[in-house]
Amino acid sequence: EPPTACREKQYLINSQCCSLCQPGQKLVSDCTEFTETECLPCGESEFLDTWNRETHCHQHKYCDPNLGLRVQQKGTSETDTICTCEEGWHCTSEACESCVLHRSCSPGFGVKQIATGVSDTICEPCPVGFFSNVSSAFEKCHPWTSCETKDLVVQQAGTNKTDVVCGPQDRLR
């Protein structure tokens, strides 16, 4: 009876279990009753990082110097190239597809430490009583306005992104 499932590192095709190609190799032809799976090594600047049945290898990532990128780790037939940014610049994401001078802290966050040549901006959430309504690479969280010191009362509570709104006190006649 033909199998309905195959072992690890195998795949089911034409009611038959065939071996997957190992990392660094692509599929040329499926196995048959009489032949093994045929695989071929990936070419220069190509890779496959899993046991697979792919007919094409993936291209290595290009670290574009026009975007400030350089190669941190050269790709192999089994691994992609890893890019990083030129000294003093910082990756915009984990995938490091482009470089920025420094990261900004979003509204609700303040700058804990300004970026340096080696470390990016460090942000921290604004605690209760403080807010930030801007994206900035230097501004800290600002304290909520103290309505009491202006002889006013809080009309609208503050949040981590907004200041309190002060208004006049209700006067009793």
Partner: nanobody
Framework: EVQLLESGGGLVQPGGSLRLSCAAS???????EMWWVRQAPGKGLERVS?????????YYADSVKGRFTISRDNSKNTLYLQMNSLRAEDTAVYYC?????????WGQGTLVTVSS
């Protein structure tokens, strides 16, 4: 396309002054936090000063505090850096930058040389 054109650099004696300008185009200048960043020969990038979009809040590195003043004219799309009491260690290429600054938007900078 973002364009930032720095000018005003030159050779100045220690203790002297210079005013750098940065003409911005290709983006809405008044909406962006702006920075002055410098790179001394053989050194890394140093963030010198920053100013918020409205020009009401500023930042200065400890190395320039009390000597440099950042300002902006949103009607002229121009950023300034007034540098007084210049020292030899202020010698560098000075760049202006918007937030965020992508590598491809990086300008040519203006060279400031402080020497007697």
């Amino acid at each position: 396309e973002v364009q930032l054109l720095e000018s005003g650099g030159g050779l100045v004696q220690p203790g002297g002054s210079l005013r750098l300008s940065c003409a911005a185009s290709g983006f809405t200048f008044r909406d962006y936090e702006m920075w002055w960043v410098r790179q001394a020969p053989g050194k890394g990038l140093e963030r010198v000063s920053a100013i918020n979009p409205q020009g009401t809040r500023t930042y200065y590195a400890d190395s320039v505090k009390g000597r440099f003043t950042i300002s902006r004219d949103n009607s002229k799309n121009t950023l300034y850096l007034q540098m007084n009491s210049l020292r030899a260690e202020d010698t560098a290429v000075y760049y202006c930058a918007k937030l965020p600054t992508y590598f491809k938007d990086w300008g040519q900078g203006t060279l400031v040389t402080v020497s007697s």
